[in-house]
């Protein structure tokens, strides 16, 4: 056959549909690959052809559009299953062509099974709700185009195995599920089952999404630097290892980029010659507030290093903050000679020095202050 622009297998579109439910799948050519839509193509005399390769087979075969009750049909740029079967799983190709033009793309379709509590291998979209923020809604997703507006479907909402009824703060309202005041206990998977009639048959659409309750913008604050702080002095002798943690708390903010970085004498560590390493760890609270810790480490600190300025910086959509660490060189204890009595004795003057120990565990960081005499 003549050459065809083959866009290959579009694995970005991992389409998953439930067994024994209707599915409408648009040809991806018009959505992602071509600059024109189906109507334009059709007007220009182009024909859309569908075929498929079964799971674990190499043979491309035409789609059978003559199945009982038109189980599989094509309408404009949409391939319809009414309903799907488990063995419909495979790679589907839509090809747009006429005598002079040809373009095609394949995409994987996976028909998945669900249990009575709607558990399945389906990848679930996540919807974030703000904690204690007032009424918020989620909407039953991806049900447009399955039935005309004249058809009034019945919608039942579930949380796991259980129909949502008589819940304290969650109210089903048709295609919407309203959360009067979202709490941590509202975290979980919510399923809407849309039931509608078509040509004397009843079809069900099942859609599950994950609700995650996150920190409210009402409570959001600029980054808070817990360490370094004014209470801790990093006092070291040359040759010792210098470890300075920068621990920053970030309120949850939708789509905010949280950043933590160190500067040494006003420069980024990459831009200076000293041998410094930075290790970062991140932990999250139940409402997705974030604690980032960056530990600045100099294995063998020099007296020059101990004179430098070490500043921790943090930035989020709420603002930018910075805090300098108190670093100083440990003064060696002078030795005094005491004469008299039965001979000589050494007396060390007592200086109080602070050593910092860094302990990581369970997302909590502790400073231990030891006084060495």
């Amino acid at each position: 056959s003549e050459r065809c622009d083959d866009w290959g297998l579009d694995t970005m579109r991992q389409i998953q549909v439930f067994e024994d439910e209707p599915a409408r799948i648009k040809c991806p050519l018009f959505e992602h690959f071509l600059k024109f839509n189906y109507s334009t193509a059709h007007s220009a005399g182009l024909t859309l052809i569908w075929y498929w390769t079964r799971q674990d087979r190499d043979l491309e075969e035409p789609i059978n559009f003559r199945l009982p009750e038109n189980r599989i049909s094509k309408e404009k740029d949409v391939l319809w299953f009414r309903p799907t079967l488990l063995n419909d799983t495979g790679n589907y190709t839509c090809m747009l062509r006429n005598t002079t033009y040809c373009s095609k793309v394949a995409f994987p379709l996976e028909v998945v099974q669900k249990d009575s509590c709607f558990n399945s291998p389906m990848k679930l979209p996540v919807h974030k709700l703000y904690i204690e923020y007032g009424i918020q809604r989620i909407t039953c997703p991806n049900v447009d185009g399955y039935f005309p507006s004249s058809v009034k479907p019945t919608i039942t909402w579930y949380m796991g195995c259980y129909k949502i009824q008589n819940f304290n703060n969650v109210i089903p309202e048709g295609m919407n599920l309203s959360f009067l005041i979202a709490l941590i206990s509202n975290n979980g998977n919510y399923t809407c089952v849309v039931t509608y009639p078509e040509n004397g048959r009843t079809f069900h659409l099942t859609r599950t999404l994950t609700v995650k309750v996150v920190g409210s913008p009402k409570n959001a604050v600029p980054p808070v630097i817990h360490s370094p702080n004014d209470h801790v002095v990093y006092e070291k002798e040359p040759g010792e290892e210098l470890l300075i943690p920068c621990t920053v708390y970030f309120s949850f903010l939708m789509d905010s980029r949280n950043e933590v970085w160190w500067t040494i004498d006003g420069k980024k560590p990459d831009d200076i010659t000293i041998d410094v390493t930075i290790n970062e760890s991140i932990s999250h609270s139940r409402t997705e507030d974030e604690t980032r810790t960056q530990i600045l480490s100099i294995k063998k600190v020099t007296s020059e290093d101990l004179k430098r300025s070490y500043v921790c910086h943090a930035r989020s959509a709420k603002g930018e903050v910075a805090k300098a660490a108190k670093v100083k060189q440990k003064v060696p204890a002078p030795r005094y000679t005491v004469e008299g009595g039965g001979g000589t004795g050494g007396l060390n003057d007592i200086f109080e020095a602070q050593k910092i120990e860094w302990h990581e565990g369970g997302g909590h960081h502790h400073h231990h202050h030891h006084h060495h005499h």
């Epitope: 249990d115 009575s116 509590c117 558990n119 949380m159 796991g160 195995c161 259980y162 129909k163 949502i164 009824q165 008589n166 819940f167 304290n168 703060n169 969650v170 206990s185 509202n186 979980g188 998977n189």
Partner: antibody, heavy 122, light 107 residues
């Protein structure tokens, strides 16, 4: 280790009400449902209803609608089943049962209480 | 509601023998079926869910099979502690319903 401990046996007069408690220990942080099931002497198991203590959701079997009330006190991890207008045929052992989460299909009756015998007699 | 029918009502088996219990649903329940064991004076205990998955701590001599409307619980070699009443339960449709039970007794 999750356990369910139920209140003691009760003897009730016809027409009165009974309230059976079910205290959960070692409860997980995730929401879960408490089921109530009864078993008349020498008979099979009959599902009565459930409650989700942390969310308030509940439902009852059609047969018991209007006579049963299932409640929960989250602060004490205790669920209650109250059955009113008692008659002799309500004489049964009443069980509470639960799963670990709301999501595990087939494991919603994973853990059972020891049962509470309610005798209805004049 | 879905009616679950168990057969036989009583099964007399000698220790060491195989026991086969049946459960039929009045309409398809897919694989959404559980089996419970109940000994006198005790609460029921979950044995099998998803028609064939053994619950935690259940010995391998217990196995479940079937889907749709016909289900079977098999105890490959009966031990003395297995003599009890066995219930099937569907959780495909609300209300969740139990069978009337099969008593497995010593022959």
């Amino acid at each position: 280790q999750v356990q369910l401990v139920q209140s003691g046996a009760e003897v009730k007069k016809p027409g009165s009400s009974v309230k059976v408690s079910c205290k959960a220990s070692g409860s997980p942080a995730e929401p879960y449902a408490i089921q109530w099931v009864r078993q008349a002497p020498g008979q099979g198991l009959e599902w009565m209803g459930y409650i989700i203590p942390s969310l308030g959701g509940y439902d009852y079997a059609q047969k018991f609608q209007g006579r049963v009330t299932i409640t929960a006190d989250e602060s004490t991890s205790t669920a209650y089943m109250e059955l009113s207008s008692l008659r002799s045929e309500d004489t049964a052992v009443y069980y509470c049962a639960r799963g670990q989460t709301l999501y595990e299909s087939g494991r919603q009756f994973d853990i059972w209480g020891q049962g509470t015998l309610v005798t209805v007699s004049s | 509601e879905i009616v679950m029918t168990q057969s036989p009502a009583t099964l007399s088996v000698s220790p060491g023998e195989r026991a086969t219990l049946s459960c039929r649903a009045s309409q398809s329940v897919s694989s959404n079926l559980a089996w419970y064991q109940q000994k006198p004076g005790q609460a029921p205990r979950l044995l099998i869910y998803g028609a064939s998955t053994r619950a935690t701590g259940i010995p391998a001599r217990f196995s479940g099979s079937g889907s749709g409307t016909e289900f079977t619980l098999t105890i490959s070699s009966l031990q003395s502690e297995d003599f009890a009443v066995y219930y099937c339960q569907q959780y495909n449709n609300w209300p969740w319903t139990f069978g009337q039970g099969t008593k497995v007794e010593i022959k």
